[in-house]
């Protein structure tokens, strides 16, 4: 069930790179950190799972991209966009954004200095 590959344009662009990686472990990792003992997330039970599972795979995926501020920011923006509708209130949105901005540091990457995580047309 692999996504469609090879968007038109420069194959080394951030868009192409973000499209190739699996950001779901990053999304789960952050959701687990902010939801803790919540019942269910996506159909995957996160009640008793170690966040390190998702974090290792998440960092591996982010590491696949060129380590530029712009590409890292695009990946974080994509994660935010993917999860926006699942975040139930403003407080949860802020928590998610805070954890998201900490993600590069957790993976020992440089955090993007300016990265707008506001999702256009959404609550986020």
């Amino acid at each position: 069930m692999r996504r469609e590959r090879g968007r038109q344009g420069d194959s080394s662009s951030c868009e192409r790179q973000v499209d190739r990686v699996n950001l779901k472990p990053c999304e789960q990792h952050i959701m687990q950190r902010i939801m803790g003992e919540q019942e269910q997330y996506d159909s995957y039970d996160i009640r008793s799972t170690r966040s390190s599972d998702q974090q290792q795979r998440c960092c591996d995926e982010l590491n696949e991209m060129e380590n530029t501020q712009r590409c890292m920011c695009e990946a974080l923006q994509q994660i935010m966009e993917n999860q926006c509708d699942r975040l139930q209130d403003r407080q949860m949105v802020q928590q998610f954004k805070r954890e998201l901005m900490n993600l590069p540091q957790q993976c020992n990457f440089r955090a993007p200095q300016r990265c707008d995580l506001d999702v256009s047309g959404g609550r986020c």
Partner: antibody, heavy 123, light 108 residues
Framework: EVQLVESGGGLVKPGGSLRLSCAAS????????MNWVRQAPGKGLEWVSS????????YYADSVKGRFTISRDNAKNSLHLQMNSLRDADTAVYYC????????????????WGNGTTVIVSS | EIVLTQSPGTLSLSPGERATLSCRAS???????LVWYQQKPGQAPRLLIY???TRATGIPDRFSGSGSGTDFTLTISRLEPEDFAVYYC?????????FGQGTKLEIK
């Protein structure tokens, strides 16, 4: 047709070296993480090593760490396993396996396997 | 290292019966990273279930996976003659990506 074909197995003395190769065809090799998995005679499966698409992240089983080196050549659609300081316990069928993930939910899995190449370490 | 223990080691059943195979992890594993494979003698393993419960393409619906945390189960609702094989669970979330020792499903 999506296919993985391993080669390079054979008989080698303890302490010797071998280089296994895996030729991939029928898919965009550079879009997939790759793994080596082995199976000793009459035993179960043992994961050996994995390498990500760009080779930036590599993992090894403790049993082979420091002796085996995984590598890939995306231009040639090939995966390799350099095996040094071989031991009797390394005798096994070595499988090359492609790792994919479910785009909608995220899980990873090895969905394409080669038929394996046999490595025998014996004096 | 996460150790996966499968039970029973051997399961003897007849075609038409229900098979329940267990996989227990030494530490909690996210459902996202739990996979089941089938292997027949002289063949490479074949992907059955990923994400603990999602059937791979082409796998009959008599195969189902369930569980969470440290306890996972593969169920075959009505055994067909071609289902007799060895089944392995694997976790692929945390390196090293360990396999269970396998459960051999044999004809009674």
């Amino acid at each position: 047709e999506v296919q993985l074909v391993e080669s390079g197995g054979g008989l080698v003395k303890p302490g010797g070296s071998l280089r296994l190769s895996c030729a991939a065809s029928g898919f965009i090799f550079s879009d997939y993480n790759m793994n080596w998995v082995r199976q000793a005679p009459g035993k179960g499966l043992e994961w050996v090593s994995s390498i990500t698409r760009s080779s930036r992240t590599i993992y090894y089983a403790d049993s082979v760490k420091g002796r085996f080196t995984i590598s890939r050549d995306n231009a040639k659609n090939s995966l390799h396993l350099q095996m040094n300081s071989l031991r009797d316990a390394d005798t096994a069928v070595y499988y090359c396996a492609r790792e994919d993930f479910d785009v909608s939910t995220g899980p990873y899995y090895m969905d394409v396997w080669g038929n394996g190449t046999t490595v025998i370490v014996s004096s | 290292e996460i150790v996966l223990t499968q039970s029973p080691g051997t399961l003897s059943l007849s075609p038409g019966e229900r098979a329940t195979l267990s996989c227990r992890a030494s530490q909690s594993v996210s459902n996202m990273f739990l996979v089941w494979y089938q292997q027949k003698p002289g063949q490479a393993p074949r992907l059955l279930i990923y994400g603990a419960s999602t059937r791979a393409t082409g796998i009959p619906d008599r195969f189902s996976g369930s569980g969470s945390g440290t306890d996972f189960t593969l169920t075959i609702s009505r055994l067909e003659p071609e289902d007799f094989a060895v089944y392995y669970c694997q976790q692929n979330g945390n390196s090293p990506y360990t396999f269970g020792q396998g459960t051999k499903l044999e004809i009674k």
